[in-house]
C-alpha cells in the first residue's frame, strides 16, 4: 500500500475542453484555416462555428501543425480523447491519426511514445465518433500539443479532451543511474527505466520522469508484469551492487517549489531468492535552490534490508518536515540488487513559494478557476472516465 | 564529440607535470571520466577516475602519485614527483552505458606521451 | 584491491579459426564487465559492455560470456583485421582495473 501515492486508475477525470474550464485563452494552434475553425472551436462535442480546429496547412508529408492546450499547471494526463468536424453532418474532416508532444516548462518539448516507442496514435474514423486513447505510460504535462497525421494531402480537423488529474506530488524530475540488465540463468531480465523522458549521459538518466513517477507498482516477482506484452522486469529499475563500490545508488528529485517533506515511498522489490532485497538504509539532504548547498546532516533511516517476507512492498522514508525544493538521496545496498518500481512523496507547499517553471505565473491574474482549488484532486461533480476491459479507449 | 590530452612531454624525474584532457562537443559534468596509462609495450593501466559529482577514484598505487579535477570542458591529471617508472602514452576516456545500463569506455582520447628522464 | 587476470597472454590462430580469451576477477563482479580491442599505435576500442552487449559497429563475430568471477570473449570466423591485444575491465561507478591483455596473432 502507498499512502499519499495516486492512483492512475482514479486520475481521468476531464480537464476541461469540453466544459470549458480551460479558457480560449489557454488554446493555441499553429494556424487556423479560417477564423471559423480556429483554436477554440477544438473542444470536444462543441458545435461552435464550423465545428472543429482545422488547420491551414496541409499535415501530409510534414507533421508540423498543432493545437497546444495549457492546463496551466502540471497534470498527469492519463487519456485523451479526438473527434473530427461534424459540424450537423457537414462535416466530413478528421485524423486518422495523430502525435503527442508535451512540456512541463513551456521551453523543453517531449513526444510522448507509448510502451514500446510508438510515437503515432490511431485517431477516428468517422468525423462524428469519440475516439478515447489511454497514455500508457501516462505524461506529467502542464502543455500538451496534439499534431494531426495524414497519410496523403486531405484536410484533417480536431476537437479534444484531455483527462487526468492535478500532479500533487509537484515532482518535476529525478535523477538516476541507468537501470541496468540482471542476467538470469533462463532469462535476460531489463530492469531499466524504458519511459523516461528527459535525458540519458554517461550512464546517468536527469531532468525527466518515468517508470518511477507512473503510478504503476510492480509484482512481487519482478519478473511479471501488470503491462501486457512486455519484457521481463518491466515495472522494476535496478541496480546491481557490482556496479556501485561505494555501497549505494544515488538520486536526486527536483520539485515544482519550496516544500516541506514528511515522508517518502519507495515500492521495492523483495525476491531475495533471486538477488532483490530492500535497502539497508536511506539517507537523504535538502536543498532550496539549484546553486545552492546540501543543508546539514542527512536525513537517516534504517531499514535492515528484510530476508524474510519476500513480497513487494512499500517502504516509508520519514523525512522529519525538511523544506528544500531539491532532495538527493542514497539507497544503501543490503543484497545484490536495488528494484524500484514506484517513488513517490507526501508533502506540504510552503505558503508564499512561488513556482519555478515557467517563470511567469502559473495562472492568469485572477482566482485560478474553481475546479481546480489546489486543495482538490479532481474537478467538482465529476466521474473519471472508467477503464474497462476491452473498453472503448484504443 | 572527442577528447584529446596534452601536456605530454619530456620531465625530469620529481617533476611536477598536469596533463588536460579537453572534451568537445559535450559537458564532462554528466560523465564519468578516466585516465588510464600505456607504458612502452605493456599493457593498459587505470590510473584513476572522476565522477559527474567530482568524486575521485585512484588506483590503490596512483594514490598521492596522482591528483585529477575536472571543469565542464576539461579534467586534468597532476602527476605530483614522476619517476621513470611512469613514461608512458596517457589516455583519457569517457564512460558511457551500453543497452544493458553498464558502463564501457565508449570515447577515447589520441593519447599523449610523457616520458620521464634524467 | 580487486585484480583482473587475463589468459592468455598470447594466442594464435588462423583465419576463419576461433579464439578464446578468458579473464578472471579476484572476486565476484556480477556483470560489470567490458572488453577492449586496441591495435598497434592506436587508442583502445569499446568491444562489449556487460559482459555480452556489443558496442555499435562491432561485428556478432565477437562474443561475450560469463558472470560473477569468470569471463570470456569469443571471436569466431577469425580476420586479418582482428589481430590486436584484447583488454578486459571492470568497470562500475567507481575504481575499473584492466587485465593484462591477450595478443591475437592471425596466421
Known amino acids: 500500500d502507498m499512502k499519499g501515492h495516486f492512483d492512475p486508475a482514479k486520475c481521468r477525470y476531464a480537464l476541461g475542453m469540453q466544459d470549458r474550464t480551460i479558457p480560449d485563452s489557454d488554446i493555441s494552434v499553429s494556424s487556423s484555416w479560417s477564423d471559423s475553425t480556429a483554436a477554440r472551436h477544438s473542444r470536444l462535442e462543441s458545435s461552435d462555428g464550423d465545428g472543429a480546429w482545422c488547420p491551414a496547412g496541409p499535415v501530409f508529408p510534414k507533421e508540423e501543425e498543432y493545437l497546444q492546450v495549457d492546463l496551466r499547471r502540471l497534470h498527469l494526463v492519463a487519456l485523451v480523447g479526438t473527434q473530427g468536424r461534424h459540424a450537423g453532418g457537414l462535416g466530413k474532416e478528421f485524423s486518422r491519426s495523430y502525435r503527442l508532444r508535451y512540456s512541463r516548462d513551456g521551453r523543453r518539448w517531449m513526444d510522448w511514445k507509448d510502451r514500446w516507442g510508438q510515437e503515432v496514435i490511431s485517431g477516428n474514423e468517422d468525423p462524428g465518433g469519440v475516439v478515447l486513447k489511454d497514455l500508457g505510460p501516462p505524461m506529467v504535462a502542464r502543455l500538451v500539443r496534439f499534431y494531426p497525421r495524414a497519410d496523403r494531402v486531405m484536410s484533417v480537423c480536431l476537437r479534444v479532451e484531455l483527462y487526468g488529474c492535478l500532479w500533487r506530488d509537484g515532482l518535476l524530475s529525478y535523477t538516476a543511474p541507468v537501470g541496468q540488465t540482471m542476467q538470469l540463468s533462463e532469462v535476460m531480465v531489463h530492469l531499466n527505466d524504458s519511459t523516461y523522458d528527459g535525458y540519458t549521459a554517461g550512464g546517468l538518466q536527469y531532468g525527466g520522469l518515468g517508470q518511477l513517477a507512473d503510478g504503476v507498482v510492480g509484482l512481487d516477482d519482478f519478473r511479471q508484469s501488470q503491462e501486457l506484452r512486455v519484457w521481463p522486469g518491466y515495472d522494476y529499475v535496478g541496480w546491481s551492487n557490482q556496479s556501485f563500490p561505494t555501497g549505494y545508488v544515488e538520486m536526486e528529485f527536483e520539485f515544482d517549489r519550496l516544500r516541506t517533506f514528511q515522508t517518502m515511498q519507495v515500492h521495492c522489490n523483495n525476491m531475495h531468492t533471486l538477488g532483490a532485497r530492500l535497502p539497508g538504509g536511506v539517507e537523504c539532504r535538502f536543498k532550496r535552490g539549484p546553486a545552492m548547498a546540501w543543508e546539514g546532516e542527512p536525513v537517516r533511516h534504517a531499514l535492515g534490508g528484510s530476508l524474510g517476507d519476500p513480497r513487494a512492498r512499500a517502504i516509508s522514508v520519514p523525512l522529519g518536515g525538511h523544506v528544500g525544493r531539491f532532495l538527493q538521496c542514497r539507497f544503501l545496498f543490503a543484497g545484490p540488487w536495488l528494484l524500484f518500481s514506484e517513488i513517490s512523496f507526501i508533502s506540504d507547499v510552503v505558503n508564499d513559494s512561488s513556482d519555478t517553471f515557467p517563470p511567469a505565473p502559473w495562472w492568469p491574474p485572477g482566482p485560478p478557476p474553481t475546479n481546480f482549488s489546489s486543495l482538490e484532486l479532481e474537478p467538482r461533480g465529476q466521474q473519471p472516465v472508467a477503464k474497462a476491459e476491452g473498453s472503448p479507449t484504443a | 564529440q572527442s577528447l584529446e590530452e596534452s601536456g605530454g612531454r619530456l620531465v625530469t624525474p620529481g617533476t611536477p607535470l598536469t596533463l588536460t584532457c579537453t572534451a568537445s562537443?559535450?559537458?564532462?559534468?554528466?560523465?564519468?571520466m578516466l585516465w588510464v596509462r600505456q607504458a612502452p609495450g605493456e599493457g593498459l593501466e587505470w590510473i584513476g577516475t572522476?565522477?559527474?559529482?567530482?568524486t575521485t577514484y585512484y588506483a590503490s598505487w596512483a594514490k598521492g602519485r596522482f591528483t585529477i579535477s575536472k571543469t565542464s570542458t576539461t579534467v586534468d591529471l597532476k602527476m605530483t614527483s614522476p619517476t621513470t617508472e611512469d613514461t608512458a602514452t596517457y589516455f583519457c576516456?569517457?564512460?558511457?552505458?551500453?543497452?544493458?545500463?553498464?558502463?564501457?569506455?565508449?570515447?577515447w582520447g589520441p593519447g599523449t606521451l610523457v616520458t620521464v628522464s634524467s | 584491491e580487486l585484480v583482473m587476470t587475463q589468459t592468455p597472454a598470447s594466442v594464435e590462430a588462423a583465419v576463419g579459426g576461433t579464439v578464446t580469451i578468458k579473464c578472471q576477477a579476484s572476486?565476484?563482479?556480477?556483470?560489470?564487465l567490458a572488453w577492449y580491442q586496441q591495435k598497434p599505435g592506436q587508442r583502445p576500442k569499446l568491444l562489449i559492455s556487460?559482459?555480452?552487449d556489443l558496442a555499435s559497429g562491432v561485428p556478432s563475430r565477437f562474443k561475450g560470456s560469463g558472470s560473477g568471477t569468470e569471463f570470456t570473449l569469443t571471436i569466431s570466423d577469425l580476420e586479418c583485421a582482428d589481430a590486436a591485444t584484447y583488454y578486459c575491465?571492470?568497470?562500475?561507478?567507481?575504481?575499473?582495473?584492466f587485465g593484462g591483455g591477450t595478443e591475437v596473432v592471425v596466421k
Open positions: 562537443g559535450f559537458s564532462l559534468n554528466r560523465y564519468y
Open positions: 572522476i565522477s559527474y559529482g567530482d
Open positions: 575491465q571492470y568497470i562500475p561507478y567507481g575504481s575499473s582495473p
Open positions: 576516456a569517457r564512460a558511457d552505458t551500453g543497452d544493458n545500463g553498464y558502463l564501457g569506455l565508449q570515447l
Open positions: 572476486q565476484s563482479i556480477g556483470s560489470v
Open positions: 556487460g559482459v555480452f
